[in-house]
């Protein structure tokens, strides 16, 4: 037999069916020009010493073979003895290691078998009623196709599916969408209506994420508040990476999960913008305010479940940074200014009450005064911090108040509202004899003592009603008792106590009269 012809003789090797899983597969045959034809196939397994034979049975029932040697592609003309206008059945037999391996056969009319391309270029993926829709441009001059897909997950083998007949300039396919695992898809096409035409090669992988992006499993930690009033939010644990099917590992566009960080600043609710969304890789600096932080995972199908954490406010207080002066017109606060043209947010809330009851006020951008201080004033009529109780005050600053991540904490402190000097007056002052020339004075703690850092000291005043001499005794804010010594028996005294803050002198308590009785010896 001539090599260019199909040989109508018994094949030149014995029959020894291997039954093995390896061997020739994916046989494709098609016309490549007006009078030439090509068949190509894949061979799976060791290729050393393998000889391939393209087998053909004509519609007449006669069978022949082409010897391809070690090649897996063979061309022949319409004069090779194979009828190209009638149906033929073709397959490959590979002879290796004394056994024969056979490919699946194809039955087709060669003249009408055109080499079809798989979907080329961009395959658009979208979600449609819980299914996956793929769409692509029909390859040039190839309108009219049957389309198949195959898909696999990281843990499952390929499964075959059918897209149905296509007859347009764009082709599409509805495929199953997995809820929680990524999938790899490949598509192939063949000529529509041409009995037994060969399938194209499989397309490049199309990598598809699960319908639900994986829930982010991350942990955060927050550093200490720095001198600049900001603290770094750091990621302790990266989100788990999505497991990908084999063909999607490495570069897998389409399966990407983006993690975004949504910050919600709970403090200072009167500012313009309370939330900001950032990329997870870019960890922000935060003020000492309270925040809710959500990590939102999303893929090309949209957002998934999010995970939320609460970052409590930094409650470290500055004992002396804030000056408050109370005048007839109202109250003014002074604190060290941060920089030029800063907007400040002053937030206050009664101590011991729910954070939701915080009130705040936003200043217009202001420059430092000549003493380098920033100020905020309010009138008595405004009612701000007007009740006689302890308030927790936090001042935040920003040069760009519209940018959530640029706020910093200036200070946090406590302030006693209303008429603090009167409200703080100690009550229940009592005097007890201590010795022949001394007494012990006790009083109930001032209301100011409920406000950390506000009560600077108590002052106990003792007045000799005879000589009108007055002595004053400072007492630590944590003490509510003092011993007065050097008193004379039989003399009338009055004692009063007041509670002072750093910027306000308190009001004396009601005078308490006492005297030490003269001891008469027997």
């Amino acid at each position: 037999c001539r090599t260019s012809e199909c040989c109508f003789q018994d094949p030149p090797y014995p029959d020894a069916d291997s039954g093995s899983a390896s061997g020739p597969r994916d046989l494709r045959c098609y016309r490549i020009s007006s009078d030439r034809y090509e068949c190509s196939w894949q061979y799976e397994g060791p290729t050393a010493g393998v000889s391939h034979f393209l087998r053909c049975c004509l519609s007449s029932g006669r069978c022949c073979y082409f010897a391809a040697g070690s090649a897996t592609r063979l061309q022949f003309s319409d004069q090779a003895g194979v009828s190209v206008l009638y149906t033929v059945t073709l397959w490959v037999e590979s002879w290796a290691r004394n056994q024969t391996e056979k490919s699946p056969e194809v039955t087709l009319q060669l003249y009408n078998s055109v080499k079809y391309e798989p979907p080329l270029g961009d395959i658009k993926v979208s979600k449609l009623a819980g299914q996956l829709r793929m769409e692509w441009e029909t390859p040039d001059n190839q309108v009219g196709a049957e389309v198949q897909f195959r898909h696999r997950t990281p843990s499952s083998p390929w499964k075959l599916g059918d897209c149905g007949p296509q007859d347009d300039d764009t082709e599409s396919c509805l495929c199953p969408l997995e809820m929680n695992v990524a999938q790899e898809f490949q598509l192939r096409r063949r000529q529509l209506g041409s009995q037994g035409s060969s399938w194209s090669k499989w397309s490049s992988p199309v990598c598809v994420p699960p319908e639900n992006p994986p829930q982010p499993q991350v942990r955060f930690s927050v550093e200490q508040l720095g001198q600049d009033g900001r603290r770094r939010l750091t990621l302790k644990e990266q989100p788990t990476q999505l497991e990908l099917p084999e063909g999607c590992q490495g570069l897998a566009p389409g399966t990407e999960v983006t993690y975004r960080l949504q910050l919600h600043m709970l403090s200072c609710p009167c500012k313009a913008k309370a939330t900001r969304t950032l990329h997870l890789g870019k960890m922000p600096y935060l003020s000492g305010a309270a925040y809710n932080v959500a990590v939102i995972s999303s893929n090309q199908f949209g957002p998934g479940l999010n995970q939320t954490w609460h970052i409590p406010a930094d409650t470290h207080t500055e004992p002396v940074a804030l000056n408050i002066s109370v005048g007839t017109n109202g109250t003014t606060m002074y604190w060290p200014a941060r920089a030029q043209s800063m907007t400040y947010c002053i937030e206050w809330q009664p101590v011991g009450q729910d954070g939701g009851l915080a009130t705040c006020s936003l200043t217009a951008p202001q420059d430092p005064d000549p003493a380098g201080m920033a100020t905020y004033s309010w009138s008595r009529e405004s009612g701000a911090m007007g009740q006689e109780k302890c308030y927790y005050i936090t001042i935040f600053a920003s040069a760009h108040p519209e940018k959530l991540t640029l706020w910093s904490t200036v200070l946090s402190t406590y302030h006693f509202g209303g008429n603090a000097s009167a409200a703080g007056t100690p009550h229940h002052v009592s005097v007890k004899n201590h010795s022949l020339d001394s007494v012990s004075v006790d009083w109930a703690p001032s209301l100011l003592s409920t406000c950390p850092g506000v009560l600077k000291e108590y002052v106990v005043r003792c007045r000799d009603e005879d000589s009108k001499q007055v002595s004053e005794h400072p007492v630590q804010p944590t003490e509510t008792q003092v011993t007065l010594s050097g008193l004379r028996a039989g003399v009338a005294y009055t004692v009063q106590v007041r509670a002072d803050t750093a910027w306000l002198r308190g009001v004396w308590s009601q005078p308490q009269r006492f005297s030490i009785e003269v001891q008469v010896s027997d």
Epitope: F8, P11, C57, G61, C63, V88, W91, K102, E105, V106
Partner: nanobody, 124 residues
Framework: QVQLVESGGGLVQAGGSLRLSCLAS???????MGWFRQAPGKEREFVAA????????WYADSVKGRFAISRDNAKNTVNLQMNSLKREDTAVYYC??????????????????WGQGTQVTVEP
């Protein structure tokens, strides 16, 4: 070793139909399968053949358009649907398996395994 057992033969009126079935013990999905027949005093002749996947089918001119061969590899069966039967279709019908597929699908000598046959009789 493949064993083939035919069934479905019988007596039928001319113009009637019969469906012959061939059950193989062992995997025959790698073999071309064929049906042959032998009338009394005549040579065994080719009726129909089918390729391994069922994509390719071949028929003797005398049965073309009346007989249809099919296979189900999952069940290891090959069927021959015979319609518009004629008196000259009377014969013993044999199922055969061809592991090699040499130079033709219709040569008796090409086939390696044979069944015992089933009788088909067509009455006028």
């Amino acid at each position: 070793q493949v064993q083939l057992v035919e069934s479905g033969g019988g007596l039928v009126q001319a113009g009637g139909s019969l469906r012959l079935s061939c059950l193989a013990s062992g995997r025959t999905s790698n073999y071309f399968m064929g049906w042959f027949r032998q009338a009394p005093g005549k040579e065994r002749e080719f009726v129909a053949a089918i390729s391994r996947s069922g994509g390719g089918t071949w028929y003797a001119d005398s049965v073309k358009g009346r007989f249809a061969i099919s296979r189900d590899n999952a069940k290891n069966t090959v069927n021959l649907q015979m319609n518009s039967l004629k008196r000259e279709d009377t014969a013993v019908y044999y199922c055969a398996a061809d592991r090699r597929t040499g130079t033709s699908v219709y040569t008796v000598d090409e086939y390696d395994y044979w069944g015992q046959g089933t009788q088909v009789t067509v009455e006028p």
